[in-house]
Amino acid sequence: ESLGWDIAELQLNHTGPQQDPRLYWQGGPALGRSFLRGPELDKGQLRIRRDGIYMVHIQVTLAICSSTSTSRHHHPTTLAVGICSPASRSISLLRLSFHQGCTIASQRLTPLARGDTLCTNLTGTLLPSRNTDETFFGVQWVRP
Amino acid sequence: ESLGWDIAELQLNHTGPQQDPRLYWQGGPALGRSFLRGPELDKGQLRIRRDGIYMVHIQVTLAICSSTSTSRHHHPTTLAVGICSPASRSISLLRLSFHQGCTIASQRLTPLARGDTLCTNLTGTLLPSRNTDETFFGVQWVRP
Amino acid sequence: ESLGWDIAELQLNHTGPQQDPRLYWQGGPALGRSFLRGPELDKGQLRIRRDGIYMVHIQVTLAICSSTSTSRHHHPTTLAVGICSPASRSISLLRLSFHQGCTIASQRLTPLARGDTLCTNLTGTLLPSRNTDETFFGVQWVRP
């Protein structure tokens, strides 16, 4: 562990109430193929415990979805991954809209610091699938 | 190699017969930019040779495709990556539907064990492009 | 650095003139969360300085975009990442079309050599967003 190979892969636990766009995550072998090795969960949000550059990746699939359901809503369904605390470091890292699709998937490299808490905000009225092969979120420490 | 840096990037060889949804892969410098360094191919399916957490990634582009061709089929075209053998470890790891798009691309972290064979199942009537920059599949060992 | 952990994450600087499909990138802490640690920029194009296998990833979001704007153009908007110099090694590594979506995102493993310059060509009449959470391009050295 001293090598700093912090890594986590999470599965969706639940969505927040209507005015809370955050997705709430869970991880651990008892739940399936999700795990936390270094990072930790704080009320369903992922907290970084080691400084470094991380590969952040996410896939979210909408639970009830057809190309019409994503396109006909007035407010487009959007997924944003960002640092939500500490407030001084709050920033959006990765953002995608579903448009006429039902799944978004992306990844990026970004510097993260110990104590950074990552939030994944899903805005819109559609809820995500909780199938573990359709919706997941992970980080991988790649270098100091 | 003793570091465990097992890694592979594969290109599409061919699809199976009608009742076999699997994609068959190939890799090696003679074929272009694909390679196998650790993992191996067993009848076109990728077999893991070292336990660990892997980053699995895939991109599949449909060969003759427009947004209408993906949306007008009754059975949506779907790509699933999973462990197909040994049977005791069979599970879907990553799943995406094309909906109104012609390409899917995603990645995830997952624990894999020596002997796990990964299958990539493409269901639907549309065939994938064999262009090496449009359809590819790879794994990268990232930690024990 | 001797470990060979070359890594870069870039943000969009600007597009080229009409007959130049290349995207021009920039990176550095002063610009936000982008950085270059090993690779370098040559007139907005990313140049590799260490041989190895790299994970290349990209996300591009179109600036003024709806599902109709991407579908109604005769020439589909396409993004291709490739080695553009030296000419002897010129090849397309990764290619995606937007179809009815407004964002593409993908990643792949590929061998790169010192001196390889990567170009990201966006063809079509639509322009990319310069928001740093919507459009980015990066590489990560993963093994020799």
Partner: antibody, heavy 119, light 107 residues
Framework: QVQLVQSGSELKKPGASVKVSCKAS????????MNWVRQAPGQGLEWMGW????????TYADGFTGRFVFSLDTSASTAYLQISSLKAEDTAVYFC????????????WGQGTLVTVSS | DIQMTQSPSSLSASVGDRVTITCQAS??????LNWYQQKPGKAPKLLIY???RLHAGVPSRFSGSGSGTDYTFTISSLQPEDIATYFC?????????FGQGTKLEIK
């Protein structure tokens, strides 16, 4: 503890208006959306829509646009449902409801307000 | 809109009986299914959310199961205080929709 207390029963004539209140206590009012649910006599539950208590933005279900208005008095931690041009078929019990941790799962309900429309 | 069809509309059972109510959605609702109990003149009370999760304080004789479009609510051993009307509700997208209710009576 969380409580939603609604105003009392109302008897109205067709064409009149009514304003039902739902006073919240035991939590920060602007943290949770307020939903409205209708139940006609002997009938099932019908979701009418909700109001974002932070932004004030209402969302109405089909069939509840025009004559139905959701509003707020955040200083009083109160949500309101106003129905204008009342019709006999508006006779029902109206409930306000709130989520806790999960989207679209209603843990807390007001006691209901019976609105009777009769000439 | 997603239609929720609940059955039966009413049922009569004895104390100690196992009681089952079903709810069918007009499309896959991905386990976003909740069950409420309503007694006469009262507001509904949440019993089960996300198909099978028991709300805090709800007796363990209540349970839920199902997937896709078909869901089941079960009372393993009916008690006199369980006399009420039970509603299912889909919580996957707006507009939220409820089943028409099942009125449970004691024989």
């Amino acid at each position: 503890q969380v409580q939603l207390v609604q105003s009392g029963s109302e008897l109205k004539k067709p064409g009149a208006s009514v304003k039902v209140s739902c006073k919240a206590s035991g939590y920060t009012f602007t943290n949770y959306g307020m939903n409205w649910v209708r139940q006609a006599p002997g009938q099932g539950l019908e979701w009418m829509g909700w109001i974002n208590t932070y932004t004030g933005e209402p969302t109405y279900a089909d069939g509840f646009t025009g004559r139905f208005v959701f509003s707020l008095d955040t200083s009083a931690s109160t949500a309101y449902l106003q129905i204008s041009s009342l019709k006999a078929e508006d006779t029902a019990v109206y409930f306000c409801a709130r989520e806790e941790d999960y989207r679209y799962v209603f843990n807390y309900w007001g006691q209901g307000t019976l609105v009777t429309v009769s000439s | 809109d997603i239609q929720m069809t609940q059955s039966p509309s009413s049922l009569s059972a004895s104390v100690g009986d196992r009681v089952t109510i079903t709810c069918q959605a007009s499309q896959d609702i991905s386990n976003y299914l909740n069950w409420y109990q309503q007694k006469p003149g009262k507001a509904p009370k949440l019993l089960i959310y996300d198909t099978s999760r028991l709300h805090a304080g709800v007796p363990s004789r209540f349970s839920g199961s199902g997937s896709g479009t078909d869901y089941t609510f079960t009372i393993s051993s009916l008690q006199p205080e369980d006399i009420a009307t039970y509603f299912c509700q889909q919580g996957v997208t707006l507009p939220l929709t409820f089943g028409q209710g099942t009125k449970l009576e004691i024989k």
